[in-house]
Interface confidence: low
């Protein structure tokens, strides 16, 4: 999916009002310095691409993020503010339902959510242009 035409301000508002707090809740008890950020993004569409991938694509050691509160709110925000996004996700959602597993917060998941926090921060702070 091409995130270029999303309403970035509305997505940012959704992040600020709820998603960020759900991420913090998920990470509660974890030191902010515990994980190094290894995933980055260069602009807002790129950030959303990386955020979608980390949030919804199961990875080795962490298969359960898609049903977390922050993930559901992320999905809702993208569906509302990114034209055509929800249509592209129907097949992916069906597949996800089939392989849903018991919820386990592993260290790998914590690391992944830490990466997500970094991506969201970058999404919320595009660098100012040098003048």
């Amino acid at each position: 999916y091409d995130f270029t035409n999303c309403d970035f301000e509305k997505i940012k508002a959704a992040y600020l009002s709820t998603i960020s707090k759900d991420l913090i809740t998920y990470m509660s008890g974890t030191k902010s310095t515990e994980f190094n950020n290894t995933v980055s993004c260069s602009n807002r569409p790129h950030c959303l691409t990386e955020i979608q991938s980390l949030t919804f694509n199961p990875t080795a050691g962490c298969a359960s993020l898609a049903k977390e509160m922050f993930a559901m709110k992320t999905k809702a925000a993208l569906a509302i503010w990114c034209p055509g996004y929800s249509e592209t996700q129907i097949n992916a959602t069906q597949a996800m339902k089939k392989r849903r597993k018991r919820k386990v917060t592993t260290n790998k998941c914590l690391e992944q959510v830490s990466q997500l926090q970094g991506l969201w921060r970058r999404f919320n702070r595009p660098l100012l242009k040098q003048q």
């Epitope: 992040y15 991420l23 702070r125």
Partner: antibody
């Protein structure tokens, strides 16, 4: 603990320039924006401009464009605001304010103590 | 530039009363921040992103609003609440409102 320490009070003549410094400590200087905001006696807060210490990018309030220059020295974790062609109405307290980009959402979460600039002939 | 208009300019109330401060934007903004300032002091962040209280801010404060209309409410004024409150937006550069002074009646 995040701290922003500004340079001392200045008295300048009309037409002169002033350069105010803001030394940051307690966080990674290049991680957050730095704003400059001023407040004339009894007046509202007035945003002047902002810098990304990470890459030196700036954005200014059009009202000050051409008169204000915001720079930074990353090795010293210090931001600077220079205002030129001073006039009496530039008499104000000048604040630097760190702007966090995390879940607080671009808010100016830490402020310097303020630098009083008096413009008088 | 987005202009923020705060009303009233001055609010004269007694401790224990409810205070309602308004901030209206000339164009729609995503959210609003509020700052408290006392004489001779730098502003302090008070409410982040429309409704999130800054650290140490008492629960008697609340923020609400969307689009062009935002409100800061103090349910029961305490002596330490008397100060000037400024709203600030980021949707288009950064601008502050003119401030509302909450003074003791």
């Amino acid at each position: 603990e995040v701290q922003l320490v500004q340079s001392g009070a200045e008295v300048k003549k009309p037409g002169a320039s002033v350069k105010v410094s803001c030394k940051a400590s307690g966080y990674t200087f290049t991680d957050d924006y730095m704003n400059w905001v001023r407040q004339a006696p009894g007046q509202r807060l007035e945003w002047m401009g902002i810098i990304s210490p990470y890459n030196g990018g700036t954005s200014y309030n059009q009202k000050f464009k051409g008169r204000v220059t915001i720079t930074r020295d990353t090795s010293a974790s210090t931001a600077y605001m220079e205002l030129s062609s001073l006039r009496s109405e530039d008499t104000a307290v000048y604040y630097c304010a760190r702007e966090d980009y995390d879940y607080d959402g671009y808010a100016m979460d830490h402020w310097g103590q303020g630098t009083t600039v008096t413009v008088s002939s | 530039e987005i202009v923020l208009t705060q009303s009233p300019a001055t609010l004269s109330l007694s401790p224990g009363e409810r205070a309602t401060l308004s901030c209206r934007a000339s164009s729609s903004v995503s959210y609003m921040h509020w700052y408290q300032q006392k004489p001779g002091q730098a502003p302090r962040p008070w409410i982040y992103a429309t409704s999130n209280l800054a650290s140490g801010v008492p629960a008697r404060f609340s923020g609400s609003g969307s689009g062009t209309d935002y409100t800061l409410t103090i349910s029961r004024l305490e002596p330490e609440d008397f100060a000037v409150y400024y709203c600030q937006q980021w949707s288009s550069n950064r601008t502050f409102g003119g401030g509302t002074k909450v003074e003791i009646k």
